[in-house]
Every structure is written in C-alpha cells, then in structure tokens.
C-alpha cells in the first residue's frame, strides 16, 4: 500500500507536471505570431483512456514532438526554453509511472493539435491529483 | 515550510527598469514554482507569471509578454521579476507567491517623474 | 482567459453575523478554486484551496464549497479580526485570475 509520504512525493510531482503542462498553454495562448498558425498543424497522438499513472507512458512517447513544435515558437517573447522544459517533464513522468512494468500505450484513432493535446494532459493531472487530496 | 523575503521598496522614472528579488529559505528552492502577483493602490490581484526555479524557464501573462522577465539564482535561492519601460500605471506592490499560498512581503514599486 | 466575478463588492455586517461571498467564473473550473484574505497594507492570507479545503491554521468558521463555475465563501459567525478583503483566484488554467475583491466592513 503506498505511504503518506509516497502520496505527498506523487502529488508534488504530478502537480509540477501540471503547472509545466499550463505553461506551455499559456506561452501557445500568448501565441499573435504566423508560427501559431504553422504549430497548430502539427498532429499529436492523444491517449485512448489515461486514468492512471501508467497510462504516462502515452505522454512520455509525444515528448520528443512537443520539444520539436514547442523549437518553432523560440523566440524573445517566448521564455520556456524547450530543451530544459522537456528535459524536466521527462524525468517527473518516468518517477510517476515508474519503470517496473511495461506498458504499451494505445492510442485514439484521432490526432490533436498541440492545445487539445496539452488541455488532455492538464485534465488527466488535475484528475489524478484530486483523488489523491 | 518556505519563507520569501522581497527587496525594498523601489522609485523609478518613466521608462526605467526595475528588479524584484525574492529570497527563499526554509525549505528545498526548487520545490515550489513561483508567482509573481501585482497589486496596484487600491485595486484588486493581478498575476504576471510564473517560474520554475529548478529550469529556470518562466510562462507570463499575455499583458507583461514583452516587458516583463523572471530569472532565478540557485545559489541564493532568490527568485527575479524585472519590469521594464515602466509607466506610472505600474505603481502598486509586487508579491512572489511560492505556489500561490506562500507570500512575500510585498515589495512597493512607484513609477513618478 | 477566465474572468472570476464576485458579490457582492462590499458588505457591511456585525461580530457573530454569518457572512457568504459568491465568486462565478466565466467557464468551469472544477474545483480549482482558491480563497484569500487580504488585509490593508498586508500580503493575501490563503483561506481556502481546492474550493473547499481549509488552509492549516485556518478558523474553521471558514468554509468554501463548489464547482464547476459557482463558488461560495461563508464566515459562519464574524470575528472582530476578519474584517478584510477577501479574494476568489481561480488555478484551473493559466492565466492565473482573481475576483475583484469583497470587502467586508464593521456595519
């Protein structure tokens, strides 16, 4: 059974996920550029269920296309550094699904752009941290 | 818990720059993001951005896009919010909010000629 | 962005009144709600998170409920030392929003 303080580390992270997750948002939202236009082109793979912390491995597997897109809109307006962002993502999602067991993600027939991908992800965050409080 | 000490309170001209610190001690820096809140006299919050002390990266609101930047120094644990081309319309108090529960002091800024 | 409306604007009451503030958001929320109290020349006291979750320390004559776009504040019997400003903030989104205020004075 997971410890309190397991629940805490869990929380804390899933709620960092969350704010990097606004973040991107909100810098897309701030978005009066051509660039916008050319980012919301971009098809992204939304989960076919994400209801536990496994199901981060579909998130995990669209990190690299995220720092591609998120690469295009680099500019003096735009603060969230891709690389450092991704890089921090990245390790906040392996400690939350954990590497014991493999799961294979499986995928909804239809694609996203990147605002409905990050919406979904946000939703899924703010999901699993109301359970745990 | 964390505490946030800001730096004092500041009188700049139109046009002119100003830095914010934030000081945090108490507990782990990087274990919350900070906010950055304003509070014009008499009026009510507004919120400029946010920053993740471990990347150093920031998101801010569409209104400061441009004018505003918050950068951080992990070994002083001290958050920035600089604000530049300053108008008198940027008078108020600037708080650092550690994950919106934990406040500064606040720190007055006065835009006048 | 999510526009966050409160009533009412100011309200006067009296020691041991029962007080309630509504906060409405332009669209739902959840129940990603916050409530604060500011006092003059002070920094926001957080009150309330996650709509209804009391903030260690706290007065438990503080409650919050709600969801979704409607939200309530309610001071079930006034102290002398909670005549404030009391401020909704809404964190379900960034941009992150505050309500106008409601200030509550000594009738």
């Known amino acids: 059974a997971p410890t309190s303080s397991s629940t805490k580390k869990t929380q804390l992270q899933l709620e960092h996920l969350l704010l990097d997750l606004q973040m991107i948002l909100n810098g897309i939202n701030n978005y009066k550029n051509p660039k916008l236009t050319r980012m919301l082109t971009f098809k992204f793979y939304m989960p076919k269920k994400a209801t536990e912390l496994k199901h981060l491995q579909c998130l995990e597997e669209e990190l690299k296309p995220l720092e591609e897109v998120l690469n295009l809109a680099q500019s003096k307006n735009f603060h969230l550094r891709p690389r450092d962002l991704i890089s921090n993502i990245n390790v906040i999602v392996l400690e939350l699904k954990g590497s014991e067991t493999t799961f294979m993600c499986e995928y909804a027939d239809e694609t996203a752009t990147i605002v409905e991908f990050l919406n979904r992800w946000i939703t899924f965050c703010q999901s699993i941290i109301s359970t745990l409080t | 818990q964390v505490q946030l000490v800001q730096s004092g309170a500041e009188v700049k001209k139109p046009g002119a720059s100003v830095k914010v610190s934030c000081k945090a001690s108490?507990?782990?820096?990087?274990?919350?993001?900070v906010h950055w809140v304003r509070q014009a006299p008499g009026q009510g919050l507004e919120w400029m951005g946010i920053i993740n002390p471990s990347g150093g990266y920031a998101s801010y609101a569409q209104k400061f896009q441009g004018r505003v930047t918050m950068t951080r120094d992990t070994s002083t644990s001290t958050v920035y919010m600089e604000l530049s081309s300053l108008r008198s319309e940027d008078t108020a108090v600037y708080y650092c909010?550690?994950?919106?529960?934990?406040w500064g002091q606040g720190t007055l800024v006065t835009v006048s000629s | 962005d999510i526009q966050m409306t409160q009533s009412p604007s100011s309200l006067s009451a009296s020691v041991g009144d029962r007080v309630t503030i509504t906060c409405r958001a332009s669209?739902?929320?959840?129940?990603?709600l916050a409530w604060y109290q500011q006092k003059p020349g002070k920094a926001p006291k957080l009150l309330i998170y996650?709509?209804?979750n009391l903030e260690t320390g706290v007065p438990s004559r503080f409650s919050g409920s709600g969801s979704g776009t409607d939200f309530t504040l309610t001071i079930s019997s006034l102290q002398p030392e909670d005549f404030a400003t009391y401020y909704c903030q809404q964190y379900n989104r960034f941009p992150v929003t505050f309500g106008p205020g409601t200030k509550v004075d000594i009738k």
């Open positions: 108490g507990d782990t820096f990087t274990r919350y993001y």
């Open positions: 996650s709509a209804s």
């Open positions: 909010a550690a994950g919106l529960f934990i």
């Open positions: 669209q739902s929320i959840g129940r990603w």
